[in-house]
Amino acid sequence: VLEVYYTSLRCRCVQESSVFIPRRFIDRIQILPRGNGCPRKEIIVWKKNKSIVCVDPQAEWIQRMMEVLRKRSSSTLPVPVFKRKIP
């Protein structure tokens, strides 16, 4: 399990994984856009076994999953998506 925490640069991900996680095992996804002291986009995944992982935003599977979730956004999302709030 990769550690996720706030750094002095306000980036939260120390390492990123590109390993596929099936949607059924994902509790929620947090998307943190570039900015607010962090120079890169970050995606944090909370899994159903209570572990947390940072996912490489360039990983094909997470891009596909986010696209599916965006298409479903008109109805209730099975996986809540949260975005970074920029003050």
């Epitope: 996680i21 099936p22 949607r23 899994k47 572990s51």
Partner: antibody, heavy 121, light 106 residues
Framework: EVQLVESGGGLVQPGGSLRLSCAAS????????MAWVRQAPGKGLEWVAS????????YYRDSVKGRFTISRDNAKNSLYLQMNSLRAEDTAVYYC??????????????WGQGTLVTVSS | DIQMTQSPSSLSASVGDRVTITCKAS??????LTWYQQKPGKAPKRLIY???ILQTGIPSRFSGSGSGTEYTLTISSLQPEDFATYFC????????FGQGTKLEIK
């Protein structure tokens, strides 16, 4: 041809332990999530546990958390289920199943023939 | 946790009949549903996945449909080998099977 062969079932007393094995062949084992599913005599199917490609991520149904441990050995193409503190309600045929490849089209596709676990005094 | 309610629990029908089995989910499962056939003493056999995709080698008399929380398996013209127990499986959030439908000869 995909083949899954379970072993290790048997009669065990309540509170006892058992380790189930599943030998896989005919596919690239390390490319798949794997799962254990059980079926009590004359009853329905019940998902027990799942494991990711390298064994680093595991998931369990609430009733077995802390008692059962799913693991795998990709070098041996084998899946395992260590069952501790067994209860009468764990009595079932236990199946291993391929669970997930990248696009999700192989969810619970191939199953073994099952191995019977009986928990009784 | 998502609950799956399958109905009917048992069904008597004759060869040639059209049969429909239903599964209702306690919440939207986004078509992430699989149907299985099981015969006594055998492992389940996958018939349909992702609601309506027929497994390779499964006869076209089997079909699936549905969306949101309601899903159906239809056998258009029952054959003798179709008498078995059928289960649905949701794979949207972990896994939950339906209780099963035993299809018997009338």
């Amino acid at each position: 041809e995909v083949q899954l062969v379970e072993s290790g079932g048997g009669l065990v007393q309540p509170g006892g332990s058992l380790r189930l094995s599943c030998a896989a062949s005919g596919f690239t084992f390390s490319d798949y999530y794997m799962a254990w599913v059980r079926q009590a005599p004359g009853k329905g199917l019940e998902w027990v546990a799942s494991i990711n490609y390298d064994g680093g991520d595991t998931y369990y149904r609430d009733s077995v958390k802390g008692r059962f441990t799913i693991s795998r050995d990709n070098a041996k193409n084998s899946l395992y289920l260590q069952m501790n503190s067994l209860r009468a309600e764990d009595t079932a045929v236990y199946y291993c199943a391929t669970e997930e490849d990248y696009d999700g089209s192989y969810v619970m596709d191939a199953w073994g023939q099952g191995t019977l676990v009986t928990v009784s005094s | 946790d998502i609950q799956m309610t399958q109905s009917p629990s048992s069904l008597s029908a004759s060869v040639g009949d059209r049969v429909t089995i239903t599964c209702k989910a306690s919440q939207n499962i986004n078509k992430e549903l699989t149907w299985y056939q099981q015969k006594p003493g055998k492992a389940p056999k996958r018939l349909i996945y992702n609601t309506n995709i027929l497994q390779t080698g499964i006869p076209s008399r089997f079909s699936g449909s549905g969306s949101g929380t309601e899903y159906t398996l239809t056998i258009s013209s029952l054959q003798p080998e179709d008498f078995a127990t059928y289960f649905c499986l949701q794979q949207s959030s972990l896994y939950t099977f339906g209780q099963g439908t035993k299809l018997e000869i009338k």
